[in-house]
C-alpha cells in the first residue's frame, strides 16, 4: 500500500505538540494523524481522550448544563465531571437531566434515605419496611387496600 | 445514522473506464476516511483506496496504484473512484466504507459500509 500525502494544510498548529505512536496507537490526551505517523495533543478545554486509540479526533468536552455544577473541568485526558444542583437528583435511565427530589415521603411511610445528586428521597412503608418504588401518591389520597396489600408499587 | 450508497457501475471491456460514487449522509465526525474496497468472485475483501477528509491524505493499493484515483467533493460529501485502464482482475463488487482511525487500511478499522456496486470487466 502506497501512501500520498496531498495535505500540507494536514501540519499542525504550533500549540498541538506531537509524538510518535506506539504500535500504532496514541496515548490518552491524544489523537492520531490521517497518516498514523504523529500523535496530536488534545486541546486543553476543548476536547480529550481518556485511552490509548487510533481515533481521528480528540472527544468534546462535555459543558455542564445549567441545573449542574462543574465538579472538575475538562483535561486533555479526562472528560469534565458534573453534577446536579442541591436539591435534584440524576438517575440512571434518565441520565438528560436533573430532577427535583421530592420533599416528602407518601402517607404512611418514612424516609430512610435523603436526596442526593445521584439519587431521589428513599422512602419505605412503617410496618414492611419495603422500598417506595418512586410514583408518589398524592398526599390526600386515602389508602385503601385489602390487608398485607401495599397501596402503591413496591420494589 | 450513517449511509452510503454506491453507484457507477457496470460492465467494461477491458482497457475502458468507469467513475464509481459513493454518496454519504449522516456523518457528523469532525474528521474521518473514506475508502474503496473490493471483493472478486470467491475472494476475501481487499482494500483499494481511502482518502481522508480533513487533510485529504490518500492511500492506494499497489494493484491499482497509476490506474485508479480516489477523490472526494466536501460539499456534497461524495467519495468518487475514477477507474481507467481497467483489467479482468478488476472484476468484483466495490464497496465504501468510513472510518474514524488513522492510517486505516484493515478492513476491521471501517464501521460503516455500502451496499456495493458490481463492476464487471470482460471483452
Known amino acids: 500500500i502506497t501512501q500520498q500525502d496531498l495535505a500540507p494544510q494536514q501540519r499542525a498548529a504550533p500549540q498541538q505538540k506531537r509524538s510518535s505512536p506506539s504500535e500504532g496507537l496514541c496515548p490518552p490526551g491524544h489523537h492520531i494523524s490521517e497518516d498514523g505517523r504523529d500523535c496530536i495533543s488534545c486541546k486543553y478545554g476543548q476536547d480529550y481522550s481518556t485511552h490509548w486509540n487510533d481515533l481521528l479526533f480528540c472527544l468534546r468536552c462535555t459543558r455542564c448544563d445549567s441545573g449542574e455544577v462543574e465538579l472538575s473541568p475538562c483535561t486533555t485526558t479526562r472528560n469534565t465531571v458534573c453534577q446536579c444542583e442541591e436539591g435534584t437528583f440524576r438517575e440512571e435511565d434518565s441520565p438528560e437531566m436533573c430532577r427535583k427530589c421530592r420533599t416528602g415521603c407518601p402517607r404512611g411511610m418514612v424516609k430512610v434515605g435523603d436526596c442526593t445528586p445521584w439519587s431521589d428521597i428513599e422512602c419505605v412503608h412503617k410496618e414492611s419496611g419495603t422500598k417506595h418504588s418512586g410514583e408518589v401518591p398524592a398526599v390526600e389520597e386515602t389508602v385503601t387496600s385489602s390487608p398485607g396489600t401495599p397501596a402503591s408499587p413496591c420494589s | 445514522e450513517v449511509q452510503l450508497l454506491e453507484s457507477g457501475g457496470g460492465e467494461v471491456q477491458p482497457g475502458g473506464s468507469l467513475r464509481l460514487s459513493c454518496a454519504a449522509s449522516g456523518l457528523t465526525f469532525p474528521n474521518y476516511g473514506m475508502s474503496w474496497f473490493r471483493q472478486a468472485p470467491g475472494k476475501g475483501l481487499e482494500f483499494v483506496s481511502a482518502?481522508?477528509?480533513?487533510?485529504?491524505?490518500?492511500y492506494y493499493a499497489e494493484s491499482v496504484k497509476g490506474r485508479f484515483t480516489i477523490s472526494r467533493d466536501n460539499a456534497k460529501n461524495t467519495l468518487y473512484l475514477q477507474m481507467s485502464s481497467l483489467r479482468a482482475e478488476d472484476t468484483a463488487v466495490y464497496y465504501c466504507a468510513v472510518t474514524i482511525r488513522g492510517a486505516a487500511t484493515q478492513t476491521w478499522k471501517y464501521d460503516y459500509w455500502g451496499q456495493g456496486t458490481l463492476v464487471t470487466v470482460k471483452p
Open positions: 482518502i481522508y477528509w480533513s487533510g485529504g491524505t490518500v
